[in-house]
C-alpha cells in the first residue's frame, strides 16, 4: 500500500535565516513540509496538524505550541490550540491564519504541518451467504466462534445504541469530536444522524444480521448527520483509543474506520503507530471508483483495506462511481445492499451499500478469527484474510485497465474452521507505487514489519526496464524495480511471507563475462532458495540470446541472461523444503503461467529469460504469471519462447507444530 | 449489579388511570430500552411494549394500542408506563424488563383494577 | 405469527433430571426462544436464549452449569440435571418475531414444574 509516494499536494516552505531569531532552526537544517489534501473542496484551511518530531515530549508539544502563539501574537495575529497529542503522534492541533505556515514551519521539534481536510462516510441478505464457508446454511447462520473475545471500536456517526440487533454489544463512549453540519436550514433528525454507525454496528454484531455476533463493540462519534468528519477529529478518536488500551489492556482489538478523506500524511502516519501497538485497523476502500491509494486512511499499508462486491461477486457500482480499487486494496466483501439495523426504529433493517459495509464485513470476520486466535498477530491476520477469500471470482473488466494487474482478485471469506490453519505457509504479493517515467526511476516494495521477502519480481507495461533486486534498507530487504531509458515505468513486487525463526539472506552474482549466462546458487549449508531476481545495467538485454535453461538436479539456484546481475534469495527456517517449477512455451505467447500444488506455497516468480520482450513476472495467489509484449509485436519465434519459473515451498516444521496440537 | 425497581402496588377504579415506575441501576441505562410485559392472576406472561431509552421511540402490542404510553427520563434512568381507560381485565402484575433481551426484571407492580 | 405451546405441567424428583419442551408453530424452526424461571411469587429470571444450534449468548446471572438448552426442528428444550429444591417453578419460553411496526413477542402458556 501507500507509503510515502502518496499522491497528495506537498508544499516546502523554505526557511529564511533572516527570521527576527524568534524561532530556533530546526535541527540539521532540516526542512519541515506543509501538505494538504488534494481534493480542492475537502480542505479545511484554517485548521493545522503541526506533527513533531518522533521522540518529542508532551512537555516540549506544549512549549512548541506556546511559542507558536507567543510568535503569532507579536505579529498580531490570534491563534487556538485545539489539542495537544501525544500517546500516539507527538504534536498540537491549531486554529490559525495560513499567513503563519512559514513561522510555524520553523518551530523546534517540527516534523511536518498537515491542513485539516474532510472525511467522508463510506455508505450509499447474500452478505452472510457469501462469507460463509459451504458447510454453513447462511439461513442458519452460525459462525464457528462469534469473536466474544475481542473488542471492535468503530469510528462513525452517532448510534442507535438500544437497537435490538445491537442492544448491550455495543458501549456508547463519551467520545465525540465532529464539525458543524453544513447548511443553515440542516435540521438533526436523530434517526438520520444514527443511520450509518447503527447499519454497521449491525453488520459487525447485530444479533440477526452479523458477521461476529459474540463481539462486543465500542463507538467513537468521528462523523455528523451528515456523515463528514475531519482528519483531525479522527486522528483525537485514534488516540483515544490508544489511551484507553494503555489504561485498561483487554484481549486483541480491531478499530474499524468506515470512512475515507484524500490522502493524508498525518492520517497514515497514526494508523501506522496504532497498527504496531497491535491494534488491527480495518478500513473503507473508498466509493470513489478511483485509485485507493489516493485516499486515507485507505492507503495506509498497516490498514486492512475493503473494496465492494456486490453478491455476483462484481465490483459495486454507486450511482455515476463505485467502490475503489488498486494496489492500496487488501480484499474486497459484501457492499452491496447489505442488510442491517435501521435507525428508523429499534427493531427496522435496511439495506445500505458501500465500501463501509464491506469494511464491516471483514471487521466482523477480523473479529471471529482474533476471538478463535487471540495471539494472532496483523500480518498472521492480514494473510489469513487473503488465504481463504475466494479466489479470481471479480470481472477484472470493471476495473480501469491500467489497475487490473495491481487489484487484488479477492472476496472476503470466514475460514471453514477458525482453528488448524497454523501449518500452512501464508504468502502475500505486495506491488509497489509506480517509479515513474524517469531513466533512473526506481519503485520500491516493502513488507511488514514481521514478514520476509522471499523474493522479488518487475513489471513494467513497456517491457522497458532494468529489472530487481533486494536489498537492504533500514535492516530490512526490500524489493527495488529499475526503469529504463524510455521506459513508461516499472512496478516492484515483493512476495512476502510469513515465516517464523527466518534467516534470509540475498546473494548475489555479477553479470558473467562468458556465455553461458549468469548463475548464482545458496551455498549456506540448510539455506533454500526462495525466489531469483535479475538486475541490468544495459539499455537492452539482448533479444537474440537464446533462453539459459537451468542444469537439472540443482534446484538452488538462480540462472539469468550473461548482462544481468543475478540475485538468489537464501533462506534458512526449521522444517523449510523449497523446490522450482518451470513452464516453458516455445510459441510466442502473452502470458505464461505455473502453480503450485495444493500444500505448497508459490514463493518465487521469475521469467526466463530476462530479455526486453518480457514485460515482468509477478505472483497472483499460488500461480506464478509471467507477462510478455503482445505477439503480433515480438519477432522470431525463439525469441518469443518464455519460461515461467516458479520456487513453491512449503514448512514441515509448522505442518508438524500444527499437529501436535490437533 | 444490574437492578430494576419498581413502583408500589395500586388500587385503581375501572376508567382510571395507572402510571407504573421503573428505575434502573448498574447499567448504562441507554444502551437497553424497557420492555414492559404483564401477568393477569394464574395466567401466562403477555408482552405490551417497548421503549427506547436512547430517543424514547415506542412500539405497542395492538391489544393495548391507544391506551398505553411508555416513557423514560434518562436524567434519573428511570422508565414509566401509563395505562389509561383501566378494565377489570387489566387487573395483573406489571414487569418491567431490560431490553428485547429481557435479561433482568423488576419485581413487579401489582394494580388491582376494582369498582 | 409463532406461537408457542408448552405443557401444563411437569414433574421430576430430586436429584433426578427433567426436560422441558416449548414448541414452535409451523414455518419457525429457526426462531430463537428465551426461556424464564418464575419462583412462586416472584418476578420471571432470564435462563437463556436457545436456538437449533443450541445456546445463544450467555447464560441469565445465577443460573447453575445444571440448567442446559437444546434445540431441534420446532422443539426448543430445557433440560435440569440434579433437581433442585429451588428449581420448583414455572418456566414461560417467549421469542420475538417481526420487525418495524409488525414487531410482537410471544410467550407460551408456562409449564408448572413440582418438585417430588
Known amino acids: 500500500q501507500e507509503d510515502e509516494d502518496g499522491d497528495y499536494e506537498e508544499l516546502v516552505l523554505a526557511l529564511r535565516s533572516e527570521e527576527d531569531g524568534l524561532a530556533e532552526a530546526p535541527e540539521h537544517g532540516t526542512t519541515a513540509t506543509f501538505h494538504r489534501c488534494a481534493k480542492d473542496p475537502w480542505r479545511l484551511p484554517g485548521t493545522y496538524v503541526v506533527v513533531l518530531k518522533e521522540e518529542t515530549h508532551l512537555s516540549q508539544s506544549e512549549r512548541t505550541a506556546r511559542r507558536l502563539q507567543a510568535q503569532a501574537a507579536r505579529r498580531g495575529y490570534l491563534t487556538k490550540i485545539l489539542h495537544v497529542f501525544h500517546g500516539l503522534l507527538p504534536g498540537f492541533l491549531v486554529k490559525m491564519s495560513g499567513d503563519l505556515l512559514e513561522l510555524a514551519l520553523k518551530l523546534p521539534h517540527v516534523d511536518y504541518i498537515e491542513e485539516d481536510s474532510s472525511v467522508f462516510a463510506q455508505s450509499i441478505p447474500w452478505n452472510l451467504e457469501r462469507i460463509t464457508p459451504p458447510r454453513y446454511r447462511a439461513d442458519e447462520y452460525q459462525p464457528p466462534d462469534g469473536g466474544s473475545l475481542v473488542e471492535v471500536y468503530l469510528l462513525d456517526t452517532s448510534i442507535q445504541s438500544d437497537h435490538r440487533e445491537i442492544e448491550g454489544r455495543v458501549m456508547v463512549t463519551d467520545f465525540e469530536n465532529v464539525p458543524e453540519e453544513d447548511g443553515t436550514r440542516f435540521h438533526r433528525q436523530a434517526s438520520k444522524c444514527d443511520s450509518h454507525g447503527t447499519h454497521l454496528a449491525g453488520v459487525v454484531s447485530g444479533r440477526d444480521a452479523g458477521v461476529a455476533k459474540g463481539a462486543s463493540m465500542r463507538s467513537l462519534r468521528v462523523l455528523n448527520c451528515q456523515g463528514k468528519g475531519t482528519v483531525s477529529g479522527t486522528l483525537i478518536g485514534l488516540e483515544f483509543i490508544r489511551k484507553s488500551q494503555l489504561v485498561q489492556p483487554v484481549g486483541p482489538l480491531v478499530v474499524l474506520l468506515p470512512l475515507a478523506g484524500g490522502y493524508s500524511r498525518v492520517l497514515n502516519a497514526a494508523c501506522q503507530r496504532l497498527a504496531r501497538a497491535g491494534v488491527v485497523l480495518v478500513t473503507a476502500a473508498g466509493n470513489f471508483r478511483d485509485d485507493a491509494c489516493l485516499y486515507s486512511p485507505a492507503s495506509a499499508p498497516e490498514v486492512i483495506t475493503v473494496g465492494a462486491t456486490n453478491a455476483q461477486d462484481q465490483p459495486v457500482t454507486l450511482g455515476t462511481l463505485g467502490t475503489n480499487f488498486g494496489r492500496c486494496v487488501d480484499l474486497f466483501a459484501p457492499g452491496e445492499d447489505i442488510i442491517g439495523a435501521s435507525s428508523d426504529c429499534s427493531t427496522c433493517f435496511v439495506s445500505q451499500s458501500g465500501t463501509s459495509q464491506a469494511a464491516a464485513h471483514v471487521a466482523g470476520i477480523a473479529a471471529m478469527m482474533l476471538s478463535a486466535e487471540p495471539e494472532l498477530t496483523l500480518a498472521e491476520l492480514r494473510q489469513r484474510l487473503i488465504h481463504f477469500s475466494a479466489k479470481d471470482v471479480i470481472n477484472e473488466a470493471w476495473f480501469p485497465e491500467d489497475q487490473r494487474v495491481l487489484t487484488p482478485n479477492l472476496v472476503a471469506a470466514l475460514p471453514p474452521s477458525t482453528h488448524g490453519a497454523g501449518w500452512q505457509l501464508f504468502c502475500r504479493t505486495v506491488w509497489s507505487a509506480h517509479s515513474g517515467p524517469t531513466r533512473m526511476a526506481t519503485a520500491v516494495a516493502r513488507c511488514a514489519p514481521d514478514e520476509e521477502l522471499l523474493s522479488c519480481s518487475s513489471f513494467s507495461r513497456s517491457g522497458k526496464r532494468r529489472g530487481e533486486r533486494m536489498e537492504a534498507q533500514g535492516g530490512k530487504l526490500v524489493c527495488r524495480a529499475h526503469n529504463a531509458f524510455g521506459g513508461e515505468g516499472v512496478y516492484a513486487i515483493a512476495r512476502c511471507c510469513l515465516l517464523p525463526q527466518a534467516n534470509c539472506s540475498v546473494h548475489t552474482a555479477p553479470p558473467a563475462e562468458a556465455s553461458m549466462g549468469t548463475r548464482v546458487h545458496c551455498h549456506q549449508q540448510g539455506h533454500v532458495l526462495t525466489g531469483c531476481s535479475s538486475h541490468w545495467e544495459v539499455e537492452d538485454l539482448g533479444t537474440h540470446k537464446p533462453p539459459v535453461l537451468r542444469p537439472r538436479g540443482q534446484p538452488n539456484q538462480c540462472v539469468g541472461h550473461r548482462e544481468a546481475s543475478i540475485h538468489a534469495s537464501c533462506c534458512h527456517a526449521p522444517g523449510l523444503e523449497c523446490k522450482v517449477k518451470e513452464h516453458g512455451i516455445p510459441a510466442p505467447q502473452e502470458q505464461v503461467t505455473v502453480a503450485c500444488e495444493e500444500g505448497w506455497t508459490l514463493t518465487g516468480c521469475s521469467a526466463l529469460p530476462g530479455t526486453s520482450h518480457v514485460l515482468g513476472a509477478y505472483a497472483v495467489d499460488n500461480t506464478c504469471v509471467v507477462r510478455s509484449r503482445d505477439v503480433s509485436t515480438t519477432g522470431s519465434t525463439s525469441e518469443g519462447a518464455v519460461t515461467a519459473v516458479a520456487i513453491c515451498c512449503r514448512s514441515r516444521h509448522l505442518a508438524q507444530a500444527s499437529q501436535e496440537l490437533q | 449489579q444490574v437492578q430494576l425497581v419498581q413502583s408500589g402496588a395500586e388500587v385503581k377504579k375501572p376508567g382510571a388511570s395507572v402510571k407504573v415506575s421503573c428505575k434502573a441501576s448498574g447499567y448504562t441505562f441507554t444502551s437497553y430500552g424497557i420492555s414492559w410485559v404483564r401477568q393477569a392472576p394464574g395466567q401466562g406472561l403477555e408482552w405490551m411494549g417497548w421503549i427506547s431509552t436512547y430517543n424514547g421511540n415506542t412500539n405497542y402490542a395492538q391489544k393495548v394500542q391507544g391506551r398505553v404510553t411508555m416513557t423514560t427520563d434518562t436524567s434519573t434512568s428511570t422508565a414509566y408506563m401509563e395505562l389509561r381507560s383501566l378494565r377489570s381485565d387489566d387487573t395483573a402484575v406489571y414487569y418491567c424488563?431490560?431490553?428485547?433481551?429481557?435479561?433482568?426484571w423488576g419485581q413487579g407492580t401489582l394494580v388491582t383494577v376494582s369498582s | 405469527q409463532p406461537v408457542l405451546t408448552q405443557p401444563l405441567f411437569a414433574s421430576a424428583s430430586l436429584g433426578a433430571s427433567v426436560t422441558l419442551t416449548c414448541t414452535l408453530s409451523s414455518g419457525y424452526s429457526s426462531y430463537e426462544v428465551d426461556w424464564y424461571q418464575q419462583r412462586p411469587g416472584k418476578g420471571p429470571r432470564f435462563v437463556m436464549r436457545v436456538d437449533t444450534g443450541g445456546i445463544v449468548g450467555s447464560k441469565g446471572e445465577g443460573i447453575p452449569d445444571r440448567f442446559s438448552v437444546l434445540g431441534s426442528g420446532l422443539n426448543r428444550y430445557l433440560t435440569i440435571k440434579n433437581i433442585q429444591e429451588e428449581d420448583e417453578s414455572d418456566y414461560h419460553c417467549?421469542?420475538?418475531?417481526?420487525?418495524?411496526?409488525?414487531?410482537?413477542?410471544?410467550f407460551g402458556g408456562g409449564t408448572k414444574l413440582t418438585v417430588l
Open positions: 417467549g421469542a420475538d418475531h417481526g420487525s418495524g411496526t409488525n414487531f410482537v413477542v410471544v
Open positions: 424488563a431490560r431490553g428485547y433481551t429481557r435479561d433482568y
